[in-house]
Interface confidence: low
Amino acid sequence: SSSDTCGPCEPASCPPLPPLGCLLGETRDACGCCPMCARGEGEPCGGGGAGRGYCAPGMECVKSRKRRKGKAGAAAGGPGVSGVCVCKSRYPVCGSDGTTYPSGCQLRAASQRAESRGEKAITQVSKGTCEQGPSIVTPPKDIWNVTGAQVYLSCEVIGIPTPVLIWNKVKRGHYGVQRTELLPGDRDNLAIQTRGGPEKHEVTGWVLVSPLSKEDAGEYECHASNSQGQASASAKITVVDALHEIPVKKGEGAEL
């Protein structure tokens, strides 16, 4: 019943499907008679003999230039020409498992495999590749203020996996050598706050200093890291004696 010239449909003579059914769903043969398993990405389709088959949803059968070795089939262009199933959308996508898949079809196939193993289904989180090193979305800004004031530095970072954000105070020693001190340390007038967002895989952190003292002056570094890399940005806190010493850029006020 699966020959290229269709005779009467005789379901009894159809080859059996696997006893557990088809991983990517069922289709019918060229004659619309026998049930067959839909083919996955990279699998043979459209040919004669073992190569005959139809692609799963979201895929199309693209004829290959040269026939697969050992496959029956007519001359090039004929009904027996074999092809392979390829994804209609051929851009990489990021799965909810944190893996980048070359196509949405491969993600769907991975999801079905996961579900068949009793794991959670994998969904598409975004188009494009998945894991990326941290980058600074909004760096901290330099601050000038008087002793006793309440000031804060903020830093917004993004990365996949979501980065870990820490703050350091950069101390410059002799000959330009620098070392960092992890904040908050044992300083009572300083607090660190971190929260997720505003976007997915983003983290925003703050250093709050209150009251500001001369010892708090210096360079503060926001440092983000994940499995893919690290990024940092810094800003200076300058402590002045009086408000009139704070330089005001045109159109800007001091951050109080």
């Epitope: 696997p18 006893p19 557990l20 073992a50 068949s116």
Partner: antibody, heavy 121, light 110 residues
């Protein structure tokens, strides 16, 4: 109906090699992943190796990694297991088995009759 | 020693109900991986009996049933028959070892 006919087993000395074959029929061989599972005398089942429909994905149990090589010839509907540096503990009945999918779910719906490998000096 | 633990043997009279347990850990059954069961009649190759914890392939009698809870799974045979005398193996996946089988349970019909 689905048939998996195995050959290549036998008695071999430690350190020597052996190649097992599994001839498949009754299903579209190049649609499915295939596996080797072994059973030592009087013992339970142990998965040895698996290969996806297009040989793009291959896996081995730690106990055979680096010594055994799985391969397939879709044109000949055949599965192979090349076993090198054989040890006494490799003595077992080796089964070839068909997966339910093209990728390696390791859910085995059809099994061969088994072929015996005895490693002894 | 097998990663999945099964009792070495269970027995029952014809018509009785027997249960075989398969105990794993948080890295296999407890991690959410499916459990499959195989039946091996004396002198024959294993045969798939239950897949995906509780599903029966066509041709498997409905007296065989499977279930899973937490880090363990079980196979029940209701109305034990003489032809059920065989070895039964559970199989799952392990995040470190990939494919894992239980040690097997011999079912004897008294």
């Amino acid at each position: 109906q689905v048939q998996l006919v195995q050959s290549g087993g036998g008695l071999v000395q430690p350190g020597r090699s052996l190649r097992l074959s599994c001839a498949a029929s009754g299903f579209t061989f190049d649609d499915y992943a295939m596996h080797w599972v072994r059973q030592a005398p009087g013992k339970g089942l142990e998965w040895v190796s698996g290969i996806s429909w297009n040989s793009g994905s291959i896996g081995y149990a730690d106990s055979v990694k680096g010594r055994f090589t799985i391969s397939r010839d879709n044109a000949k509907n055949s599965l192979y297991l090349q076993m090198n540096s054989l040890r006494a503990e490799d003595t077992a009945l080796y089964y070839c088995a068909k997966d339910i999918s093209g990728s390696q779910l390791v859910l085995l719906d059809y099994w061969g009759q088994g072929t015996t490998v005895t490693v002894s000096s | 020693q097998s990663v999945l633990t099964q009792p070495p043997s269970v027995s029952g009279a014809p018509g009785q109900r027997v249960t075989i347990s398969c105990t794993g850990s948080s890295s296999n059954i407890g991690a959410g991986y499916d459990v499959h069961w195989y039946q091996q009649l004396p002198g024959t190759a294993p045969k798939l009996l239950i897949y995906g914890n509780s599903n029966r392939p066509s041709g498997v009698p409905d007296r065989f049933s499977g279930s899973k809870s937490g880090t363990s799974a079980s196979l029940a045979i209701a109305g034990l028959q003489a032809e059920d005398e065989a070895d039964y193996y559970c199989q799952s996946y392990d995040s470190s070892l990939s494919v894992v089988f239980g040690g097997g349970t011999k079912v004897t019909v008294l």
